[in-house]
């Protein structure tokens, strides 16, 4: 089996303020078992946007049914985008453990926010 890759096909996405942003992410393998997390930014100061395993993320919904068998699509939609949401978003695969540990990150998708049309 080939090692899992995290694919973020869009290098950049532009969304009008007030709209929803869809950030695409797929993985190429069911192995290893473990959750997906989304972050804005990289490094120690990165901001958690969504954690498949736990947490409450009222503005975030998953695009596909992530509980379904053989699902490899972990794209998310973020509602009511504001200029403060601009940044680079990373889809990160974690490996099951105590605690779960980071396994591989996607290349990132840069979100830019356009002014709300008048």
């Amino acid at each position: 089996e080939e090692e899992l890759q995290v694919i973020q096909p869009d290098k950049s996405v532009s969304v009008a303020a007030g709209e929803s942003a869809i950030l695409h992410c797929t993985v190429t393998s069911l192995i290893p078992v473990g959750p997906i997390q989304w972050f804005r930014g990289a490094g120690p100061a990165r901001e958690l946007i969504y954690n498949q395993k736990e947490g409450h993320f009222p503005r975030v919904t998953t695009v596909s049914e992530s509980t379904k068998r053989e699902n490899m699509d972990f794209s998310i939609s973020i509602s009511n985008i504001t200029p403060a949401d601009a940044g680079t978003y990373y889809c990160v695969k974690f490996r099951k453990g105590s605690p779960d540990t980071e396994f591989k990150s996607g290349a990132g998708t840069e979100l830019s926010v356009r002014a709300k049309p008048s």
Epitope: I31, V33, E54, E70, N71
Partner: antibody, heavy 119, light 110 residues
Framework: QVQLVQSGAEVKKPGASVKVSCKAS????????INWVRQAPGQGLEWIAM????????HYNQIFKDRATLTTDTSTSTAYMELRSLRSDDTAVYYC????????????WGRGTLVTVSS | DIVLTQSPDSLAVSLGERATINCRAS??????????IFWYQQKPGQPPKLLIY???NRDSGVPDRFSGSGSGTDFTLTISSLQAEDVAVYYC????????FGQGTKLEIK
């Protein structure tokens, strides 16, 4: 950490019903399947059924399809397994188990609930 | 329905020696490029513990003396050097369709 806490032991008479609960913590309950498995004294493991708490999709072992019902309460992160028309050979430890990879496998287990069926 | 048959039913192995448990499926459990076989260890009075998933992948925290192999219909769980704490009953499970378990193999120390 993931925890599945099951309800206490039950003693039932033949023909009665039992409802076993499994309270989940340490993860988002609606994001992972829950399986139910039983083990009669000194015997092997027998898969009963599974439920997706996000939409209540269920799959049942044909042997239990007419007697078992799985439900969830997402407000309390609790899964339930009801077994009706109990017989003496339903005496077993009943386990709930969470499927962390949507592989129809059982990654994390509760400690089990002993159900004794005796007249 | 796919039936899993484990062999042997019981096994006694000396400490430090290799233990091998087999699991044969009545039809192939390979689908979408994966072998849908899992191995569990159950010690007395405890729930089962997942050891191996998708035939050959060790679960988190499982010692590397445990390994899984096989494809299609024939699968093996190997313990390369038996330790006292490995005494248990071992079960295979498939999920090519809805799950079923093998009947179990009891592993003891010789």
């Amino acid at each position: 950490q993931v925890q599945l806490v099951q309800s206490g032991a039950e003693v039932k008479k033949p023909g009665a019903s039992v409802k076993v609960s499994c309270k989940a913590s340490g993860y988002t309950f609606t994001n992972y399947w829950i399986n139910w498995v039983r083990q009669a004294p000194g015997q092997g493991l027998e898969w009963i059924a599974m439920i997706d708490p996000s939409d209540s999709e269920t799959h049942y072992n044909q042997i239990f399809k007419d007697r078992a019902t799985l439900t969830t309460d997402t407000s309390t992160s609790t899964a339930y397994m009801e077994l009706r028309s109990l017989r003496s050979d339903d005496t077993a430890v009943y386990y709930c188990a969470m499927d962390y990879g949507s592989l129809y496998a059982m990654d994390y287990w509760g400690r089990g609930t002993l159900v004794t069926v005796s007249s | 329905d796919i039936v899993l048959t484990q062999s042997p039913d019981s096994l006694a192995v000396s400490l430090g020696e290799r233990a091998t448990i087999n699991c044969r499926a009545s039809q192939s459990v390979r689908s979408s490029g994966y072998n849908w076989i899992f191995w569990y260890q159950q010690k007395p009075g405890q729930p089962p513990k997942l050891l191996i998933y998708l035939a050959s992948n060790r679960d988190s925290g499982v010692p590397d003396r445990f390994s899984g192999s096989g494809s299609g219909t024939d699968f093996t769980l190997t313990i390369s050097s038996l330790q006292a704490e490995d005494v248990a009953v071992y079960y295979c499970q498939h999920s090519r369709e809805l799950p079923t378990f093998g009947q179990g193999t009891k592993l003891e120390i010789k």
